[in-house]
């Protein structure tokens, strides 16, 4: 509970041993008490003891003094704990009873009799001081005292403030009498859970987890966290803010790792060389003549600089060199000549000119020779002037380049085209490749140089049905079927059923005209197909052997733009306003002979040459379909009609339009 009402019984006097009803107790009144504590009532009434009730064991007979007892049976003062905010007012009923029965639990015994009772009503503040009282009636007297105190960890005027002292992660405090927290030394905050850091610990840079501590945040150090830590890579530097690297005197670089006084500190340069504090390593050595190496530690041969002139030979000596001069020369470097033009000193046709009144001479050398006496042959190939692997050859006053096959020019800088000598026969198109020329042949020819003529009779296989007559087209692979009466189709494969009463003459005339027109169209198509047709085995080889106007009509893969989710290829015709068809399925069967492109051509009845659109495909696309427009195929030089082969997923159809 939050508090306890305590009642201390001190003395009870019943000298005559009488009960409240006037009877006397035999042999004496064995007395116990019942206490009822309830909310304040102006007139005490029966009913529940709202604040609590308690009974005692038999405390004595007739008159007796009650001693304090802290535990066990007969505890005194009596404890009435409550678990609510103490209201400050109360009603208390104390009854004295006689029991003929058990001493320890008399309230349960039958035959108990009331001796006397007192009622106290009033106000009582929480506190440790006892309020003492004495009640008398005609027969008895009771001395007692009482108070209200708060239970452990409850504080305040009404015992409503809970405070439990603690010293752990959640707080470090004791409780004041009013229930407020009193922080233990070194702790602060509303719940005394914030340590008081070491005095002077930097507010931003430092913190602490226990009193008198100063833990630094990243980048700071020192007792009070007021000094920064330099950058991880810093070598000879300090900082004014964390992770900085401000170089100490004499050091430079991003991480202060370059010694600006390396020469002074390390003296790296040897053999009297000059040291300067520069360069990637922080120093550079400038060597004296005759020395080399990063630190001038390597001594050069004294003769390394070829000091002897005019063919003199050099000999190394301990600290210098000596020149052995050829006849006619003298001086430290054989620089002086004893010869004159009279001695004919100029070789290889050099002409001699006298100098210094004839005491010396100078040779004027012809091309290809040099030296003071024209004794040295000029090597004009030292600069590697020949390109593309050509071999340089000194030839008299000049040099020539001997070129590898396929190259020409004074420096072998020009590439000779293998196609320059026109190796392809019968109008084959030549292509320069690394391994030599490759010919792409026109229709009707094959072979490495298009030298083989292909002979093939398109009618030999008997392609026409129902007794139709077969005519070979202009191209060896093309044919036209002339159908007998009653049959139609590119191969005359479809019978025509006619009603009996039919205007035969008119129809025959009409059909004849149609057939003639179809034949005419097919012949023209055949002429075109002559250029377009290629057998499967030649298609790859012949693909580029197109005439000029055919080349104009090529559509490279780059011009075929797929703009449709259904994998259809759309071709843009640009300035030419012709209509054209869609090219579906990413392949074009460009080898269909005109004879195979009649209405209702049956799938599977003709050889396929599926040509990937990745290669240049000669298209003659010209249809009445509005789905796409075709450009880059209509050559101004191409006066022939154009046709479009539509390869759709449902059926194959060829729509042909002619241009006159």
């Amino acid at each position: 509970g939050s508090g306890i009402f305590q009642l201390r019984l001190q003395e009870f006097v019943n000298q005559r041993g009488m009960l409240a009803n006037g009877q006397s107790c035999e042999p004496g009144c064995r007395t116990f008490f019942r206490i009822c504590l309830k909310h304040f009532q102006a007139t005490f009434s029966e009913g529940p003891c709202t604040f609590g009730n308690v009974s005692t064991p038999v405390l004595g007979t007739n008159s007796f003094v009650v001693r304090d007892k802290n535990s066990g049976s007969g505890r005194n003062p009596l404890q009435l704990p409550f678990n609510f905010t103490w209201p400050g007012t109360f009603s208390l009923n104390i009854q004295a009873w006689h029991t003929p029965g058990d001493d320890l639990r008399p309230e349960t015994s039958p035959g108990n009799s009331l001796i006397s009772q007192i009622i106290i009503q009033g106000s009582l503040a929480v506190g440790k001081i006892w309020r003492t009282d004495e009640q008398n009636d005609t027969l008895t007297r009771l001395s007692y005292s009482y108070r209200v105190i708060c239970s452990d960890n409850y504080y305040g005027e009404s015992c409503s403030r809970l405070c439990k002292k603690r010293d752990d992660h959640f707080g470090h405090y004791e409780c004041q009498p009013d229930g407020s927290l009193s922080c233990l030394p070194g702790w602060t905050g509303k719940y005394c859970d914030q340590p008081i850091c070491l005095s002077g610990c930097h507010e931003q840079n430092g913190y602490c987890s226990k009193p008198d501590e100063c833990i630094c945040r990243p980048g700071w150090q020192g007792r009070l966290c007021n000094e920064c830590i330099p950058h991880n890579g810093c070598r000879h530097g300090t900082c004014s803010i964390p992770w900085q690297c401000a170089c100490d005197e004499g050091w430079g670089g991003l991480f202060c790792d370059q010694d600006l006084n390396y020469c002074t500190h390390h003296s790296p340069c040897k053999n009297g060389s000059t040291c300067s504090n520069s360069g990637p390593k922080g120093y550079t050595c400038t060597c004296l003549p005759g020395y080399t190496g990063e630190h001038c530690e390597l001594g050069l041969s004294k003769c390394a600089s070829n000091p002897c002139r005019n063919g003199g030979s050099c000999k190394d000596q301990e600290n210098s060199y000596h020149c052995l001069c050829p006849p006619g020369y003298y001086g430290q470097h054989c620089e002086h000549s004893t010869l004159t033009c009279a001695d004919s000193p100029c070789f290889n046709g050099g002409s001699c000119r006298e100098r210094n009144q004839g005491s010396s001479y100078a040779c004027e050398c012809p091309p290809n020779f040099t030296g003071s006496n024209c004794e040295k042959k000029v090597d004009r190939c030292t600069s590697n002037p020949c390109a593309n692997g050509g071999q340089c050859q000194n030839r008299g006053p000049s040099r020539t380049c001997r070129c590898r096959p396929g190259f020409t020019g004074t420096h072998c800088e020009l590439h000779i085209s293998d196609c320059a000598r026109s190796p392809c026969a019968h109008g084959g198109t030549c292509h320069d490749l690394e391994n030599g020329p490759v010919c792409t042949c026109p229709a009707g020819f094959s072979g490495r140089r298009c030298e083989v003529r292909i002979t093939h009779d398109a009618c030999a296989s008997g392609p026409c049905f129902n007794g139709a007559t077969c005519y070979t087209g202009l191209s060896p692979n093309n044919f036209v079927c002339n159908c007998p009466y009653g049959f139609v189709g590119s191969r005359c494969e479809f019978p025509v059923g006619l009603p009996p009463s039919f205007p035969w003459v008119a129809v025959s005339l009409g059909v004849g005209l149609v057939v003639l027109l179809v034949l005419l169209v097919m012949v023209v198509v055949a002429v075109r197909q002559l250029r377009l047709r290629r057998p499967d085995d030649e298609s790859r080889e012949a693909m580029n052997n197109l005439s000029d106007f055919q080349k104009d009509n090529l559509i490279p893969a780059a011009q075929l733009k797929n703009t449709n989710q259904k994998k259809e290829l759309e071709v843009d015709c640009g300035l030419d306003k012709s209509n054209c068809g869609k090219l579906q399925n990413h392949t074009l069967d460009y080898n269909l002979a005109p004879g195979l492109l009649g209405r209702g051509g049956m799938p599977g009845k003709y050889p396929h040459s599926d040509k990937s659109l990745g290669e240049k495909v000669p298209l003659r696309l010209h249809s009445e379909k509005p789905e796409c427009r075709i450009s880059a195929i209509c050559s101004p030089r191409d006066s022939m009609y154009q046709s479009v082969c539509l390869i759709s997923e449902e059926r194959n159809e060829c729509v042909i339009a002619t241009e006159v």
């Epitope: 833990i215 020192g222 007792r223 000094e227 330099p230 991880n232 890579g233 810093c234």
Partner: antibody, heavy 118, light 107 residues
Framework: EVQLVESGGGLVQPGGSLRLSCAAS????????MAWVRQAPGKGLEWVAT????????YYRDSVKGRFTISRDNAKSSLYLQMNSLRAEDTAVYYC???????????WGQGTLVTVSS | DIQMTQSPSSLSASVGDRVTITCRAS??????LAWYQQKPGKSPKLLIF???NLADGVPSRFSGSGSGTDSTLTISSLQPEDFATYFC?????????FGQGTKLEIK
């Protein structure tokens, strides 16, 4: 080139003492905080102690507090770890490292093995 | 103390592989995290600091990322010299703590 060279490791009985040294070169020793980090055989890394560069403030892991003392001699560019009341659980390779408890350990020595065994 | 948990504890991979090692802190460490590489019998070497900054002289195939409690070390294309044990370390809170390590082995 930054170099940290530890010495002083060895075999010692429980309750015994050992003093580890670390000679630093290749950087201005007095400018940087230093630390000791240890690694028990086949185990992970464990920070042991740190000393600041400025005022020599020291910090220790709880398990070595009162037994180990970290110190430095800026004039000699040296770091030390005095280890007293050694226990079997202190057995490890001890690395000298440049860094604080709140910064990365940028450079490490080759380590010195301390074995505490009876 | 902040607990650092690395995963996996061991990992087999081949030269040229892309490898990822993760490190989880028991509370937010605000990017104050480093990665170290240690080869057998050698001392650790700093690879990455502040979660994603490459230490001086470390090849660019190493990279770090993460925030809050989770961090990652990535090796974009394993080289023979990369087979070693890798440790993460937080230095946001006192005391500094290391992960238990991830051993990267040749498959």
């Amino acid at each position: 080139e930054v170099q940290l060279v530890e010495s002083g490791g060895g075999l010692v009985q429980p309750g015994g003492s050992l003093r580890l040294s670390c000679a630093a070169s290749g950087f201005t020793f007095s400018n940087f905080p230093m630390a000791w980090v240890r690694q028990a055989p086949g185990k992970g890394l464990e920070w042991v102690a740190t000393i600041s560069s400025s005022d020599g403030t020291t910090y220790y892991r709880d398990s070595v507090k009162g037994r180990f003392t970290i110190s430095r001699d800026n004039a000699k560019s040296s770091l030390y770890l005095q280890m007293n009341s050694l226990r079997a659980e202190d057995t490890a390779v001890y690395y000298c490292s440049r860094g604080y408890y709140n910064s990365p350990f940028a450079y490490w020595g080759q380590g010195t093995l301390v074995t505490v065994s009876s | 103390d902040i607990q650092m948990t690395q995963s996996p504890s061991s990992l087999s991979a081949s030269v040229g592989d892309r490898v990822t090692i993760t490190c989880r802190a028991s509370e937010d460490i605000y990017s104050n995290l480093a990665w170290y590489q240690q080869k057998p019998g050698k001392s650790p070497k700093l690879l990455i600091f502040d979660t994603n900054n490459l230490a001086d002289g470390v090849p660019s195939r190493f990279s770090g990322s993460g925030s809050g409690t989770d961090s990652t070390l990535t090796i974009s294309s394993l080289q023979p010299e990369d087979f070693a044990t890798y440790f993460c370390q937080q230095y946001n809170n006192y005391p500094p703590t290391f992960g238990q390590g991830t051993k990267l082995e040749i498959k």
